[in-house]
Amino acid sequence: VPPGEDSKDVAAPHRQPLTSSERIDKQIRYILDGISALRKETCNKSNMCESSKEALAENNLNLPKMAEKDGCFQSGFNEETCLVKIITGLLEFEVYLEYLQNRFESSEEQARAVQMSTKVLIQFLQKKAKNLDAITTPDPTTNASLLTKLQAQNQWLQDMTTHLILRSFKEFLQSSLRALRQM
């Protein structure tokens, strides 16, 4: 999880704590940096990043995606609807981030950092959305069986799944970051 202050700020005359929006923005950028590092290892290890067979594996996954109805895009943007979608989506990604935990050798700590930082980000966003009650939490039983199913895949599918999770999570966070900047 990133420190609450930039090292540059230490010299500042008044070290004020980060505001809610600053914390969220910084947290997302920190997670995106972590995803970049994990993607680097994935792409170096296999040719998944250039594979044209993504659609095969994608059928098995139900990764959260921003859609027009979620109100997070420039056209039809809706602050409340979008905030609910971001939080719901992040909660849905948690099971996939759990899956990633044993998928990395040299970046094992980075994978853990991405997972833990996402939990913190969810907490930040839930505080921001304290008056919104439309947030549904994924069912733990469904998540457990999904995790078992993903871990039972063959090696090629596991590699492809890892690649797709990282790519989708990156896209989701980038869309979230853009949307949050209008909030």
Partner: antibody, heavy 120, light 111 residues
Framework: EVQLVESGGGLVQPGGSLRLSCAAS????????MSWVRQAPGKGLEWVSR????????YYADSVKGRFTISRDNAKNTLYLQMNSLKPEDTAVYYC?????????????WGQGTQVTVSS | SYDLTQPPSVSGSPGKTVTISCAGT?????????VSWYQQLPGMAPKILIY???KRASGIADRFSGSKSGNTASLTISGLQSEDEADYYC??????????FGGGTHLTVLG
Amino acid sequence: EVQLVESGGGLVQPGGSLRLSCAASGFTFSSYAMSWVRQAPGKGLEWVSRISSGGISTYYADSVKGRFTISRDNAKNTLYLQMNSLKPEDTAVYYCVRYAWGVQWAFDFWGQGTQVTVSS
Amino acid sequence: SYDLTQPPSVSGSPGKTVTISCAGTSSDVGYGNYVSWYQQLPGMAPKILIYDVNKRASGIADRFSGSKSGNTASLTISGLQSEDEADYYCASYRRGETIVFGGGTHLTVLG
């Protein structure tokens, strides 16, 4: 074509009130955070206030906090600035500005401004 | 006094290059890549040139470029043209959800 047209400026006595309006057209108003920026005669620019796209969050410069209130009506595509307890130092051209989409803290469109003069 | 420090004026001949500096602190210019630059022609509203330190706004010529080092941002205008004569303002996000501007720099194109 994006257009921001301010109105409601004028001459007011110290301690008085004014309500500025900004009519937006040519874009989906409800998708954008908006701000007011002012410019005193012959001086530089000063950020005044910001409101999120849905009107949930508002922010103010210290110089106007407690006196000015920013609001918006997305159904009418209109941004407002209610100015109370006006002081001579509030005399300026007030610009209605749009935040660039997905960019933090940059204004991609500006209105032509409305003049506010606070004088006895 | 303004929160960000800009030189009051700069000048250059047509075709030449000028750079306008914008000095701040670690709480604003140095905090993140949230610096933007605006051009204001006489009697007109400001117009965005650069955002996020070095990204050119739509329709802005590549003669305009932005950069940042530490707590100081810079706007560079190359191949100066007479129509570049205007006031230029830098702006930056400041920690605590506010925006601060520089005092403005008047660019004179000589000759």
